[in-house]
C-alpha cells in the first residue's frame, strides 16, 4: 500500500492503489547538498548525478571507528524521498548531489557556501530549466550563509531547507532563518509536530510550512535494493523539494514568490496540534502541512496572499518591529500584535522603494510584532493614504479617493500611551467600503491599490465585550487581504490573518476584571481578481 | 522569516582601533563587523569568511586577500587563503589566527567577517 507520507501529500483525486500523480517533475533539476550517496541504489539509479563537488571537514575524534560504507545513509535516503522510483515524491525529477557533509553528517558554513557558489557557476555555464536546491542541514544563525541563499534565490533558484531538529525557534538557525529560503518543519502520521528524542522539529515564524518527517520510508545505503525508515526535518524538506519540482514542471515560469504562495495555498490548514509548540510560538508558527495541488494546470486565477510576522521588537519604549514582503509581492495590509496589549499600533511606510509594515511598542509593553499581508498582484499600483488624528468624537477616517483604487487594508498608529483611557469611536457607518475608521487619537492609514479586475469588500464581526478572540473569514473565492480591529483600545492585543480568517485577540474580561461594555469588532477586507480569473479561463 | 536587522542570537563585535598604517581606512562612517556562532560547540575558530562589499570585483577580492597575507606576515603570522568567492558573494575564506581580526576588519572593501562554524544533517 501507499506509504502514509505519500498519501498525506496527495490530493484525493490521485489516491489509488499506488501514488501516481501526473508529471513527475521531469523538467526540473534538484540539487542535493548532503552526505555522499549510493547512486547505484535501484531507487535512484539513473536519476541522480554525483557531481565532483566535495567540501567536508575531517571526522571528529580519534576514538571514532568510521565505517566508510555507511557514509551514504542520509543523502541516499533523501534522494530517494525526492525522486525515488517507488517511494519518491517527484519520480521524474533528476538530481545532482554535492557532498558537503562528512560521514558523521557534519559540514561547515564555508563548505556549504562554496557548494552554493558551485551551483550558481554551473547554472551560468549551462542554463537548464527550473532549479531546486535542497539543503537538509542546519547550523547556528549565519549572516553569510543567509546572504548567499538570498543571492542564489534572486538568481531564480528555489531553495528548500530543513527547519532543524532542536525543538527551538527556527530563526536561530541557518539557512532556516533566511527569508528567501522555503523552510520546512516536520509532522507525523497524526499531523502532530515530530518529536525526536528529547527534542523535535523547530517551529516559529521562520518556518514556512510543515511536511511529513517521521517514519519516512526511503532508500537505504545498506544494499542497492534496501529500504529504511528515517525521521527528521530533512525528510520533511525533501517532500517539499519534490512537491516544488512537480509544481515547477507543470508551470516552469513560476517565480519563487509564486511557488511559495502556491505551496502555502495548497497545504492542509489547521491540522497540527499547536499545544506541542511553546505558548509564545503558537501564533507565529504556520499551521500548514504541505500537499500537491489538485490539478496540474496552474491556479493563476487565484489571488494568493500569505502572512509574514516580524521579529519581536523587544521591550524598550520606542522599540519597533518591521515585517517585509518578498520583492515580487505587494504589501496589501499591515497589523500589529502585543501579548501585553501595550502597543501604539502600526503603519505602512516606504523603505528602499518598497512598502514595509512597522509596529510600535508602548511604554510598559513587553514588545510588539508587525504582521504583513503579502500578496501576488500583477500590475498592481498601491499607495498609502494617511489621515492624522481627528481629535473629534467620530474618530479618524480615511478612504481611497483615486479613481479605480480599492481598499485592501487599514492600519492605525497612535502616540498616546493608552487608547483605553479615551472614549472609543463610533463604528463606521455601513455602505462605505473604501474607508478606514479608527480612534480619534490615532492616525489612520489606508492601503489603496489599483490592479486589473481587483475588487474588494469589507466584512465585520463584532461581539459585545472582549472574550479573548473575535474572528471573521472571507468566503470561498475571496482572499483575505486586510485584517484589523475596531476599536483600537487597550483591550485589543492586536489583529492578524490566519489563512483566510481575520483574528482579533483581546484580553478576556473575565480574567482582567474589567466591566467595559464596549464591542470588539474584527474587520476583514476580502478581495478577488476578475482579471486573473478571466485570464485563467482564456488559457484553458 | 528572519529580518536582516532582526535581533538574532549571535555575537557581533565591531572591532575598532587606531589606524593601521599599512591598511587603507574603510569608507568613512562604516565599521566592518565580526560575527560568530552563538553555540560554542559549533564554532570553528581559526577559519574566517571575509565578506566584501557588494560590488567588489574578483580582482579586488584577490588583492584584498593578498594584502591581508602581507600585513599578517609583517606581524609574524602565517595565513592561508583557502578560497576566493565570486559568483554569489565577493570575499574569501582564510585560515588565520583570531589575533588578526582587528587588522582584517580595517581592510578596504570589507563588509563583515564571519568565523566559520559547523552545520549538521537534520
Amino acid at each position: 500500500s501507499i506509504p502514509w507520507n505519500l498519501e498525506r501529500i496527495t490530493p484525493p483525486r490521485y489516491r489509488a492503489d499506488e501514488y501516481q500523480p501526473p508529471d513527475g517533475g521531469s523538467l526540473v533539476e534538484v540539487y542535493l547538498l548532503d552526505t555522499s550517496i549510493q547512486s547505484d541504489h535501484r531507487e535512484i539509479e539513473g536519476r541522480v548525478m554525483v557531481t565532483d563537488f566535495e567540501n567536508v571537514p575531517e571526522e571528529d575524534g580519534t576514538r571514532f571507528h568510521r565505517q566508510a560504507s555507511k557514509c551514504d545513509s542520509h543523502g541516499t535516503h533523501l534522494a530517494g524521498v525526492v525522486s525515488g522510483r517507488d517511494a519518491g515524491v517527484a519520480k521524474g525529477a533528476s538530481m545532482r548531489s554535492l557532498r558537503v557533509l562528512n560521514c558523521q553528517g557534519k559540514g561547515t558554513v564555508s563548505g556549504t557556501l562554496i557548494g552554493l557558489e558551485f551551483i550558481r557557476k554551473s547554472q551560468l555555464v549551462q542554463p537548464v530549466g527550473p532549479l531546486v536546491v535542497l539543503l537538509p542541514l542546519a547550523g547556528g544563525y549565519s549572516r553569510v550563509l543567509n546572504a548567499a541563499c538570498q543571492r542564489l534565490a534572486r538568481a531564480g533558484v528555489v531553495l528548500v531547507t530543513a527547519a532543524g531538529n532542536f525543538r527551538d525557534d527556527a530563526c536561530l538557525y541557518s539557512p532556516a532563518s533566511a527569508p528567501e529560503v522555503i523552510t520546512v518543519g516536520a509532522t507525523n502520521a497524526q499531523d502532530q509536530p515530530v518529536t525526536l528524542g528529547t527534542l523535535g522539529t523547530n517551529f516559529g515564524r521562520c518556518v514556512d510550512l510543515f511536511a511529513p518527517g517521521e517514519d519516512i520510508i526511503g532508500a537505504s545505503s545498506d544494499c542497492s535494493t534496501c529500504f529504511v525508515s528515517q525521521s527528521g526535518t530533512s525528510q520533511a524538506a525533501a517532500h517539499v523539494a519534490g512537491i516544488a519540482a512537480m509544481m515547477l514542471s507543470a508551470e516552469p515560469e513560476l517565480t519563487l514568490a509564486e511557488l511559495r504562495q502556491r505551496l502555502i495555498h495548497f497545504s492542509a490548514k489547521d491540522v497540527i496540534n499547536e499545544a506541542w509548540f511553546p505558548e509564545d510560538q503558537r501564533v507565529l508558527t504556520p499551521n500548514l502541512v504541505a500537499a500537491l495541488p489538485p490539478s496540474t494546470h496552474g491556479a493563476g486565477w487565484q489571488l494568493f496572499c500569505r502572512t509574514v510576522w516580524s521579529a519581536h521588537s523587544g521591550p524598550t519604549r520606542m522599540a519597533t518591529a518591521i515585517a517585509r514582503c518578498a520583492p515580487d509581492e505587494e504589501l496589501l495590509s499591515c497589523s500589529s500584535f502585543s501579548r501585553s496589549g501595550k502597543r501604539r499600533g502600526e503603519r505602512m511606510e516606504a523603505q528602499g522603494g518598497k512598502l514595509v509594515c512597522r509596529a510600535h511598542n508602548a511604554f510598559g509593553g513587553e514588545g510588539v510584532y508587525a504582521i504583513a499581508r503579502c500578496c501576488l498582484l500583477p500590475q498592481a499600483n498601491c499607495s498609502v493614504h494617511t489621515a492624522p488624528p481627528a481629535e473629534a468624537s467620530m474618530g479618524t477616517r480615511v478612504h481611497c479617493h483615486q479613481q479605480g483604487h480599492v481598499l485592501t487594508g487599514c492600519s492605525s498608529h497612535w502616540e498616546v500611551e493608552d487608547l483605553g483611557t479615551h472614549k472609543p469611536p463610533v463604528l463606521r457607518p455601513r455602505g462605505q467600503p473604501n474607508q478606514c475608521v479608527g480612534h480619534r487619537e490615532a492616525s489612520i492609514h489606508a492601503s489603496c491599490c489599483h490592479a486589473p479586475g481587483l475588487e474588494c469588500k469589507v466584512k465585520e464581526h463584532g461581539i459585545p465585550a472582549p472574550q479573548g478572540q473575535v474572528t471573521v473569514a472571507c468566503e470561498e473565492g475571496w482572499t483575505l487581504t486586510g485584517c484589523s480591529a475596531l476599536p483600537g483600545t487597550s483591550h485589543v492585543l492586536g489583529a492578524y490573518a490566519v489563512d483566510n480568517t481575520c483574528v482579533v485577540r483581546s484580553r478576556d474580561v473575565s480574567t482582567t476584571g474589567s466591566t467595559s461594555e464596549e464591542a470588539v469588532t474584527a474587520v476583514a477586507i476580502c478581495c478577488r481578481s476578475r482579471h486573473l480569473a478571466q485570464a485563467s479561463q482564456e488559457l484553458q | 522569516q528572519e529580518d536582516e536587522d532582526g535581533d538574532y542570537e549571535e555575537l557581533v563585535l565591531a572591532l575598532r582601533s587606531e589606524e593601521d598604517g599599512l591598511a587603507e581606512a574603510p569608507e568613512h562612517g562604516t565599521t566592518a563587523t565580526f560575527h560568530r556562532c552563538a553555540k560554542d560547540p559549533w564554532r570553528l575558530p581559526g577559519t574566517y569568511v571575509v565578506v566584501l562589499k557588494e560590488e567588489t570585483h574578483l580582482s579586488q577580492s584577490e588583492r584584498t586577500a593578498r594584502r591581508l597575507q602581507a600585513q599578517a606576515a609583517r606581524r609574524g603570522y602565517l595565513t592561508k587563503i583557502l578560497h576566493v568567492f565570486h559568483g554569489l558573494l565577493p570575499g574569501f575564506l582564510v585560515k588565520m589566527s583570531g589575533d588578526l581580526l582587528e587588522l582584517a576588519l580595517k581592510l578596504p572593501h570589507v563588509d563583515y567577517i564571519e568565523e566559520d562554524s559547523s552545520v549538521f544533517a537534520q
Epitope: E59, D60, G61, T62, R63, F64, H65, R66, Q67, K70, C71, S73, H74, L101, C103, Q104, G105, K106, A138, N165, F166, L196, G197, T198, L199, E214, D215, S220, S221, V228, S229, Q230, S231, G232 | K39, D40, P41, W42, S118, F120, A121
Partner: antibody
Framework: EVQLVESGGGLVKPGGSLRLSCAAS????????MNWVRQAPGKGLEWVSS????????SYADSVKGRFTISRDNAKNSLYLQMNSLRAEDTAVYFC????????????????WGQGTMVTVSS | ESVLTQPPSVSGAPGQRVTISCTGS?????????VHWYQQLPGTAPKLLIS???NRPSGVPDRFSGSKSGTSASLAITGLQAEDEADYYC???????????FGGGTKLTVLG
Amino acid sequence: EVQLVESGGGLVKPGGSLRLSCAASGFTHSSYSMNWVRQAPGKGLEWVSSISSSSSYISYADSVKGRFTISRDNAKNSLYLQMNSLRAEDTAVYFCARDYDFHSAHYDAFDVWGQGTMVTVSS
Amino acid sequence: ESVLTQPPSVSGAPGQRVTISCTGSSSNIGAGYDVHWYQQLPGTAPKLLISGNSNRPSGVPDRFSGSKSGTSASLAITGLQAEDEADYYCQSYDSSLSGSVFGGGTKLTVLG
C-alpha cells in the same frame, strides 16, 4: 509503545565471550543512535559504547576498547554487543538505551532504556 | 573514578529542598555540552529526569529542576517526598573521550 528489550546475558568464565542483543520497537530505530551502559553490582552507571544511526560512527569506553564490538541491524530493529576476552570487572547489568542521532550537533539524553540483562564473569 | 563528580550522598526531611551538584571540566560541561539527569529507583532501570540542562520530560513533577553554569550543573528537588529516595546520576558528552560520561551517582535519603 516505545520499548527496548535486552537479552543474551548469563554466566561466563574469564576470557570467554558473550553476545548481547537489544530489540527495539515502537519508534524509527534507524534515526536513533544506540548505546550500551553497564552497572556493576552496587556501583554507578558506566557508558560502554555508542553506535550512530547508520553505523558510520562507533565509539567505546577505554575499559572495553579492543574487546567489545557494537553493531546494529536497522532492518531487524536490533542492537548487539559482542563481548570477548571477558574479565571479572565486566560483571554488571547491561542496559541498552537510545538517543536521537543529531549528527554530533547535540548529544541527547538517553530517553528510553531497556530493563537490563545481567552478565556475570566468574570462574 | 568518574569524569563528572557528584557527592556520594545527600539527605533531607520530607518537604525540604535538596540540591545535587555535578562538576565537570572544559572538555565536557564547560565545552557547552548539555547535562542530563537520571533517577534510578532500587532494582530498576534509570529513568530520564532532566534533559538539556533544565528540561523536564512529560510526567516528571515540577519539583525537579536542573541548571547549568560554567563547568558544573545541579539538580534541585523541592518538597521532598519519600518516593524521591533513589540514586541520581548526571551525564554529559566529553569531546576528549569522544563519548558519554556519567557522574558517580548520588544516593538521596529522605529522612524520617
